[in-house]
């Protein structure tokens, strides 16, 4: 079988200030069953982003369906992009476990921000 | 309070059709997954059929061919049209909503649905 | 095809356990759900193989491992009379499953 890769195919994604910047994930598999997190940074200190599981992320919004139940396109879209937002962004696959277990990340995707247009 | 309420059962003749609705409120319907399962008379459950918030749909073999799930977000309606009823599809219908993970974590009361000649 | 016990008893008050087996971890989640009577509506007492919506009583517990589930009722009541079904839903195939149902019956 097979193992699983998280794909992030955007090594880097600029965004002009106040728009909405979009996040390419793909899953090769959906086996083992678990869900997708995406982070800011990588450590202990790193920052969630977006929860398939639960959680409340207003700025955030799945590309593709996500009740679907052969989705594995866990792309994103964050709105109203500021200065703040830079980083390097991470597609990370869990496996369920109590609690679940990190399993497979992304490269990861770079998200620079330019000044708004005047 | 989630609230799930179907209707649209009855008895009918093997051969013949029913819709049946399930009517939502209490969440947002149209983020969620939700399905049909099915319970025949001193039976277990069986699931039948489920459909994504964006129309994606899915069935048991036994019923493929012949029901059809659908929904309304505009109305928070879910909708199983089920045609050629056989005896075998004597059961009560309830509607369910899905997890993340496409489990139920909320039931309406059902409805029955019984095939009789 | 996922299997559970058709019945267990259990004296007031001790912890009962009801397994099902037959799925496979990797690929399957777990819920269970309970029905006080057939043909009564389904009430979900755990999902996601060990969480627990909020109406449920901490009493109920569940847990996976391998190719079991196991559903805990710690410090059994009277109220907790009723069929248990294990459900799974199966990632490869798309498909949710049920076991037959356990009896529960409370002494």
């Known amino acids: 079988e097979e193992e699983l890769q998280v794909i992030q195919p955007e090594k880097s994604v600029s965004v002009a200030a106040g728009e909405s910047a979009t996040l390419n994930c793909t899953a090769t598999s959906l086996i083992p069953v678990g869900p997708i997190q995406w982070f800011r940074g990588v450590g202990p200190g790193r920052e969630l982003i977006y929860h398939q599981k639960e959680g409340h992320f207003p700025r955030v919004t799945p590309v593709s369906d996500p009740t679907k139940r052969n989705n594995m396109d866990f792309s994103i879209r964050i709105s109203n992009i500021t200065p703040a937002d830079a980083g390097t962004y991470y597609c990370v696959k869990f496996r369920k476990g109590s609690p679940d277990v990190e399993l497979k990340s992304g490269a990861g995707t770079e998200l620079s921000v330019r000044a708004k247009p005047s | 309070d989630v609230q799930l309420v179907e209707s649209g059962g009855g008895v009918v003749r093997p051969g013949e059709s029913l819709r049946l609705s399930c009517a939502v409120s209490?969440?947002?319907?149209?983020?969620?997954?939700m399905s049909w399962v099915r319970q025949a008379p001193g039976k277990g459950l069986e699931w039948v059929s489920g459909i994504s918030s964006g129309g994606d749909t899915y069935y048991v073999d036994s019923v493929k061919g012949r029901f059809t799930i659908s929904r309304d977000n505009s109305k928070n309606t879910l909708y199983l049209q089920v045609n050629s009823l056989t005896a075998e599809d004597t059961a009560i219908y309830y509607c369910a909503r899905e997890t993340w993970n496409h489990l139920f974590d909320y039931w309406g009361l059902g409805t029955l649905v019984t095939v009789s000649s | 095809a996922l299997t559970q016990p058709a019945s267990v008893s259990a004296n007031l008050g001790e912890t009962v356990k009801i397994t099902c087996s037959g799925g496979?971890?990797?690929?399957?989640?777990y819920g269970w759900y309970q029905q006080k009577s057939p043909g009564s509506a389904p009430v979900t007492v755990i999902?996601?193989?060990?969480e627990r919506p909020s109406d449920i009583p901490s009493r109920f517990s569940g847990s996976a491992s391998g190719s079991t589930a196991t559903l805990t009722i710690t410090g059994v009541r009277v109220e907790d009379e009723a069929i248990y079904y294990c459900g799974a839903y199966d990632g490869s195939t798309y498909a949710n499953t049920f076991g037959a149902g356990t009896t529960l019956t409370v002494l």
């Open positions: 496979d971890s990797s690929s399957h989640y």
């Open positions: 999902y996601s193989d060990d």
């Open positions: 209490g969440f947002r319907f149209s983020s969620h997954a």
